[in-house]
Amino acid sequence: KLLQVSTIAMQQQEKLIQQERALLNFTEWKRSCALQMKYCQAFMQNSLSSAHNSSPCPNNWIQNRESCYYVSEIWSIWHTSQENCLKEGSTLLQIESKEEMDFITGSLRKIKGSYDYWVGLSQDGHSGRWLWQDGSSPSPGLLPAERSQSANQVCGYVKSNSLLSSNCSTWKYFICEKYALRSSV
């Protein structure tokens, strides 16, 4: 009789363990579903906001021809500025022409006045050549006016209507650039 009771007790305990496992699996499954739902909602929200926002440039960006520009409101060193632009899907400003330079300097005058703004130009430590971030050379009229006397890495910035150079570790505002979205109409 005692053996029978003991066997029943063990069976009940085994059943309880199985139920606990099932509950644990269910909880895990539920958590996984909630997580997937969160990802799904984020994706949907992202897609919807992209669909609604059909303007060529994001909010707070300035458009000129095929480009969108973002003028920062914070200071950072050149390398951090570069990363801040990447977070927005853009790169530091690459000035292709005098027309673009005039647009940028004109816009800056209207927005902020005479401050320093990092652009995507840096000087190769070995050759001393100035290069844009994509590896291309600036046109002759778009070379920094003064050579920085810094022993550290030297980067380019815009101030008023000039392109100048400075130690990359100094703090400045910065300008990001990305392509404007083409209208699908």
Epitope: K87, D134, K178, Y179
Partner: nanobody, 113 residues
């Protein structure tokens, strides 16, 4: 969430191609890039590419390294040519988003004869 591959041992002047695949769990990636860290040095940005395909390179690799991505934008590649001993480092992939940044585990690149 980010899986790198393609590292290894190569002789000076040789080439390697690194790949980084992003899983579907990373949303709103605006750019992807490669960083490297040599022993006793800070991690530095080597190259990056935006979701519009605009590249950016460190001065030390311009003309030697090329960053590219597949059409879906889920995989980014770093073609490294004319490798030098000073390119020896652990190379990390990074996904740039407005919020969190996502890093890979890293792949070792050793340039030695």
């Amino acid at each position: 969430q980010l899986q790198e591959s393609g590292g290894g041992l190569v002789q000076p002047g040789g080439s390697l191609r690194l790949s980084c695949a992003a899983s579907g769990r990373i949303f709103s990636v605006n750019a992807m890039g490669w960083y490297r860290q040599a022993p006793g040095k800070q991690r530095e940005l080597v190259a990056a590419i935006t979701n519009q395909g605009a590249p950016t390179y460190a001065d030390s690799v311009k003309g030697r390294f090329t960053i590219s991505r597949d059409n879906a934008g889920n995989t980014v590649y770093l073609q490294m040519n004319s490798l030098r001993p000073e390119d020896t480092a652990v190379y990390y992939c990074k996904a740039f988003t407005r919020g969190d940044d996502y890093w890979g585990q890293g792949t070792q690149v050793t340039v030695s004869s």
